[in-house]
Interface confidence: medium
Amino acid sequence: RAVPGGSSPAWTQCQQLSQKLCTLAWSAHPLVGHMDLREEGDEETTNDVPHIQCGDGCDPQGLRDNSQFCLQRIHQGLIFYEKLLGSDIFTGEPSLLPDSPVGQLHASLLGLSQLLQPEGHHWETQQIPSLSPSQPWQRLLLRFKILRSLQAFVAVAARVFAHGAATLSP
């Protein structure tokens, strides 16, 4: 793995994979099915999803001081979204198109999370809230919101890895 018991990931590898995730998240977003945005509502349905916030040490100073705080937060988010994309929200009906990038997105989330997981070290992962609805018309809404939230998450993660690759790589 890229973090063999140490505290520094393979920043360049992580940067490349996170950029790929950004592209996939944006390409997957319009393909979740037709949804009338008037139906969306103001309050965030996926308000339990992980967000990278100020206290998570993902700013340049925090990354220099101890990148593990930020990397753990990113790792938690990646696992969270990876589980969501593998759940019946995305695997259930209505079926995604055969060429949907969601499958690739799912695999890439897992790949990046494995790059960040130190060998023999297990970070706590966040519990997935009971978001799984039984009805397809509700799944469409959740897919839309999850992917929109994922876009924001991977955009921040990509910036973190870009900074790390530029300034923290050995």
């Epitope: 139906e39 309050e43 009805q135 018309w137």
Partner: antibody
Amino acid sequence: EVQLLESGGGLVQPGGSLRLSCAASGFTFSYYTMGWVRQAPGKGLEWVSSIWPSGGATWYADSVKGRFTISRDNSKNTLYLQMNSLRAEDTATYYCARDRDTAMADWGQGTLVTVSS
Amino acid sequence: DIQMTQSPSSLSASVGDRVTITCRASQSISSYLNWYQQKPGKAPKLLIYAASSLQSGVPSRFSGSGSGTDFTLTISSLQPEDFATYYCQQSYSTPLTFGGGTKVEIK
């Protein structure tokens, strides 16, 4: 025991407004999608609107979109339907229903809304 | 919108008869089909959900089958309390839509 009790129906003139309420008990209200279904006298069932457990998403039938607003107060275990610009064709018994599994598993007794001049 | 077509719109039957009501969707809805019973002046009652699952407390003489576009509600031996109107409903996509109803009357 699950109970859904609608109120707020009555006679209203065309163009008028009414607010229906549905008081829920016997289950954890904030966990469930809730909805309204109506039935015009002597007619079949028509879905009107549904709302996500958190209130963060709503769905409407085209016939009421822009005129009706569904909302909920999870602290009060109450579902609402604000009906504006009422028309004669909105005359119906309005039922509150709880979604469970893939269906509307529990229904209230209904409240009659009559739109007439 | 998905249209739900029920047939027949009404039928006459006797106690003990086997009764079959059909419901057709205008497009595939997989197994997202529910059946309700309604008696005059009362709220609808869920009988069958997900095409074939019997709702808790509903007698086993009621059964549902079908997938895709064609569905059936069967009452194996009609009882006096079964005389009512039956509705199918799809929960595949919004707007959620109901069939026009089938009124089961005493012959």
